[in-house]
């Protein structure tokens, strides 16, 4: 079998909302896939699982089943969301998102994501991950791959 | 028109639990956003926060009274509770509910006070 | 837990002066309420988000400040005003400073 290839595009939206007396900001981050299937025969995507770090802290966890399947020599783009909520014990991270002082309210965040492949019955994981920014400050839709020079660090594959 | 209203017992000796009753009107504690504190007020001394009740029964509690402080709520009656264990004469003062409107950090109602005395 | 320290504890105020009472915090904070509580009486919200006159407050009441450093100022004082002034923050945790005491000369 050849190999199934996931590249993590980067960030296609982030949706914020915020609840001021719990000091708490919820982030919708929605983000883009290409999933390339070398083979000469279909592949089925059984699912993605992802989760989203800040500060080493996970702050929010999707898991996509049954995605799609994807023919052979052929690619697809998936979006997947991962809901997130930066808690009170980061408070101070409301003030920073919500501080009408502050032009830019990006924040670093990781995003790691596991993709999980069929054929034939044999199953593949491939992991990605990536620190990202995020504007917690409004929400922002990112041209698709926009994202990808805001990278400040691409752990080694 | 949003009013609160505080009740306790008045008198307490020490090592008791305190068990006070907040009963509001003119809003509700389901809708989304809100909140109620309990505050008190020694005697010549400031305020201190004791412990807030949010509106999807979330709490947050005054870090060093934690361990004695249990607030709760009844949205039916349009009542929160606050329970504090141990008491002793520190505990001597006049306990406030207060109002946090929908998606509001600041109070903008308050109850007329409970006097609480802890005596031996 | 932040600190609101408020200065002066007590202040003495003539009719007609104007005057500025303190909060410091402890740690940076995006703004802070004010509340005023008169002899015998339940605090009452004078102003929120650090300089926004709460309902049917006079206007000579003004806040200021940014960061660590607050202030509210009555313009001309009455002697209603004779109350205990407090700040209070919901930033980190929930603190009220100690309080002022503006009494009247």
């Known amino acids: 079998p050849r190999s199934i290839d996931v590249k993590y595009i980067g960030v296609k939206s982030a949706y914020v909302s915020y609840d001021v007396q719990k000091r708490t900001i919820y982030l919708n981050i929605t983000n883009t896939l290409n999933i390339t299937n070398n083979n000469y025969y279909s592949v089925e995507v059984e699912n993605i699982t992802a989760q989203v770090q800040f500060a080493k802290t996970v702050i929010g966890k999707a898991r996509l089943n049954n995605i799609t399947h994807i023919g052979p020599l052929d690619m697809k783009q998936i979006d997947y969301t991962v809901p997130t909520v930066i808690a009170e014990e980061m408070s101070y991270m409301y003030d920073f998102c919500t501080l009408i002082s502050i032009k830019v309210h990006n924040i670093v965040l990781m995003m790691q994501v596991t993709v999980t492949t069929t054929y034939f019955g044999h199953s593949e994981q491939i992991s990605q991950e990536r620190y990202q920014y995020v504007d917690c400050g409004r929400n922002t839709t990112y041209q698709l791959g926009q994202s990808e020079y805001l990278n400040v660090l691409q752990p080694q594959q | 028109q949003v009013t609160l209203k505080e009740s306790g017992p008045g008198i307490l000796q020490p090592s008791q639990t305190l068990s006070l009753t907040c009963s509001f009107s003119?809003?509700?504690?389901?809708?989304?956003?809100?909140?109620v504190s309990w505050i008190r007020k020694p005697s010549g001394k400031g305020l201190e926060w004791l412990a807030h009740?949010?509106?999807?029964?979330?709490?947050r509690y005054n870090l060093f009274l934690k361990s004695r402080l249990t607030v709760s709520k009844d949205t039916s009656s349009n009542q929160v509770f606050l329970m504090i264990t141990s008491v002793d004469t520190t505990d001597t003062a006049t306990y406030y509910c207060?109002?946090?409107?929908?998606?509001?950090?600041?109070?903008?109602?308050w109850g007329q006070g409970t006097s609480l005395t802890v005596s031996s | 837990q932040i600190i609101l320290t408020q200065s002066p504890a007590i202040m003495s105020a003539s009719l007609g002066e104007e005057i500025t009472l303190t909060c410091s915090a402890s740690l940076s904070i995006s703004y802070v309420h004010w509340y005023q509580q008169k002899s015998g009486a339940s605090p009452k919200l004078l102003i929120y988000?650090?300089?926004n006159l709460a309902s049917g407050v006079p206007s000579r009441f003004s806040g200021s400040g940014s960061g660590t450093f607050y202030s509210l100022t009555i313009s001309s004082v009455e002697a209603e005003d004779a109350a205990d002034y407090y700040c209070?923050?919901?930033?980190?945790?929930?603190?009220f400073g100690g309080g002022t005491k503006l009494e009247m000369k």
């Open positions: 003119g809003f509700s504690l389901s809708t989304s956003g809100m909140g």
């Open positions: 209070h923050q919901w930033s980190i945790y929930r603190t």
């Open positions: 988000g650090t300089s």
């Open positions: 009740i949010f509106w999807d029964d979330d709490k």
């Open positions: 207060a109002r946090m409107g929908r998606q509001r950090d600041y109070f903008d109602y």
